[in-house]
């Protein structure tokens, strides 16, 4: 997250981290039920660990943390790497969470966000695009949903209904390491960090997010059948 601020501890209890090896964060994720996470489909890896209830970027133990393995990764069938359409994936964890003030699911928005809606994006991604600077703790950033027209003008030929753009003034954006993390609007999960230009946080190059309102049925059906 570029030019965000430290999230309040436990204010994003649905925020997850996907880890390679013992503790290398490579993507964010979102808890949507006691045993299921959402993340970006481009975050798919054969072996990874899941960390919930953690505030710090470092692997130091925190009392609220819970660690899991992913036992099933189900990318949306319409996703084709390295494209950006349908960029979401369900992950089933090896067990259910212990519900606590640090770990809680978030409800997915059934209605699509409208232009001007204020939202919160969060993650442990780099705070500077051209240098890999990482925050000490989870970062939060208020962003505004942009019109479809403005989104398409920013990225001609790259935007479809499975995406929405959101941003703020130049200098504020999600960035590398934030992929798969939550965009929460009015208390409901509206999007996942998906893509954007390089470097992050350029004028007229907003972040692009998976438009989850388009996938509510697929998410419910997939969870029910697995």
């Amino acid at each position: 997250i570029v030019n965000g601020s430290d999230c309040q501890k436990d204010a994003q209890p649905w925020q997850g981290a996907l880890l390679l090896g013992p503790n290398k964060l490579y993507c964010g994720a979102v808890l949507i039920s006691p045993q299921w996470l959402l993340t970006a489909a481009h975050c798919r890896k054969p072996v990874f660990r899941i960390r919930l209830g953690h505030h710090s970027m470092s692997p130091v133990y925190e009392s609220g943390q819970q660690m899991f393995q992913g036992i099933k990764s189900i990318p949306h069938p319409g996703y084709s790497h390295p494209g950006h359409s349908n960029d979401l994936m369900l992950i089933k964890m090896n067990r259910k969470i212990r519900d606590s003030h640090s770990v809680k699911p978030v409800e997915i928005a059934c209605d699509c966000a409208t232009e001007g809606t204020r939202c919160m994006v969060s993650g442990w991604g780099t705070t500077s695009s051209s240098h890999n600077n990482f925050p000490k703790v989870l970062q939060c950033l208020n962003i505004t949903v942009l019109s479809e027209e403005r989104c398409k003008n920013s990225y001609p030929g790259q935007i479809d209904k499975t995406m929405f753009c959101a941003g703020d003034e130049e200098g504020r954006d999600s960035c590398q390491g934030d992929s798969g993390g939550p965009v929460v609007c009015n208390g409901k999960l509206q999007g996942l960090v998906s893509w954007g230009d390089f470097p992050c946080a350029q004028r007229n190059r907003p972040g692009v997010y998976t438009n989850l309102c388009e996938f509510v049925k697929w998410i419910k059906d997939t969870m029910n059948s697995n």
Epitope: C27, G83, Q158, D197
Partner: antibody
Framework: QLQLQESGPGLVKPSETLSLTCTVS??????????WSWIRQPPGKGLEWIGN???????YYNPSLKSRVTISVDTSKNQFSLKLSSVTAADTAVYYC????????????????WGQGTTVTVSS | EIVLTQSPGTLSLSPGERATLSCRAS???????LAWYQQKPGQAPRLLIY???SRATGIPDRFSGSGSGTDFTLTISRLEPEDFAVYYC????????FGGGTKVEIK
């Protein structure tokens, strides 16, 4: 299948500007999934990254070459170009163009498609 | 700039043997940002491994990568005749740099 082809003069005089073009076929340059790179390799030596150009035309250069390098893109021709000014004999090398992939994960996908390279000699 | 030092400079082995190539960084590099390439004479480099341990498309499973921090390794479990080449590591954690290369030659 995506292919990259470098082209440009094989001989450049010292103090002049080296200009090379990379033509992309079998795919489109304006893609928000990819960036485009230049790399060079002096005779008998290792590889040196020169710079990248991204979807919007934003660039990222090797700090040691930054003052002399310009990478640009011509989407209408599906080409991207390298200009290296004030060349010396030390710039004699095989120059490669390549493609990389980027997203907002914290992950490096490598340079997965390369041109075959073009030799540039700097000599009077 | 992060300097990558590869060793040995040359590795003389016979087909069927195991090759272990080392890449050491002058400062810590995220393993997610390390790649390995193979280059044969007169050809462009070919991506073998990305993210320190993930094989690129079409790369046989005799090639494997490992490591973290400042020490990374490329292993070829059983050398085939077509594996004799020069191998380069690359980091993209900060301004991208390549190692000096390791030549794997037939003994």
């Amino acid at each position: 299948q995506l292919q990259l082809q470098e082209s440009g003069p094989g001989l450049v005089k010292p103090s002049e500007t080296l200009s090379l073009t990379c033509t992309v076929s079998g795919g489109s340059i304006p893609s928000s999934s990819y960036y485009w790179s230049w790399i060079r390799q002096p005779p008998g030596k290792g590889l040196e990254w020169i710079g990248n150009i991204y979807y919007s035309g934003s660039t990222y250069y090797n700090p040691s070459l930054k003052s002399r390098v310009t990478i640009s893109v011509d989407t209408s021709k599906n080409q991207f170009s390298l200009k290296l000014s004030s060349v010396t004999a030390a710039d004699t090398a095989v120059y490669y163009c390549a493609r990389g992939e980027y997203d907002r994960s914290y992950y490096y996908w490598g340079l997965d498609v390369w041109g075959q390279g073009t030799t540039v000699t700097v000599s009077s | 700039e992060i300097v990558l030092t590869q060793s040995p400079g040359t590795l003389s082995l016979s087909p069927g043997e195991r090759a272990t190539l080392s890449c050491r960084a002058s400062q810590s590099v995220s393993s997610s940002y390390l790649a390995w390439y193979q280059q044969k004479p007169g050809q462009a480099p070919r991506l073998l491994i990305y993210g320190a341990s993930s094989r690129a498309t079409g790369i046989p499973d005799r090639f494997s990568g490992s490591g973290s921090g400042t020490d990374f390794t490329l292993t070829i479990s059983r050398l085939e005749p077509e594996d004799f080449a020069v191998y380069y590591c690359q980091q993209a954690f900060s301004s991208p740099t390549f190692g000096g290369g390791t030549k794997v030659e037939i003994k």
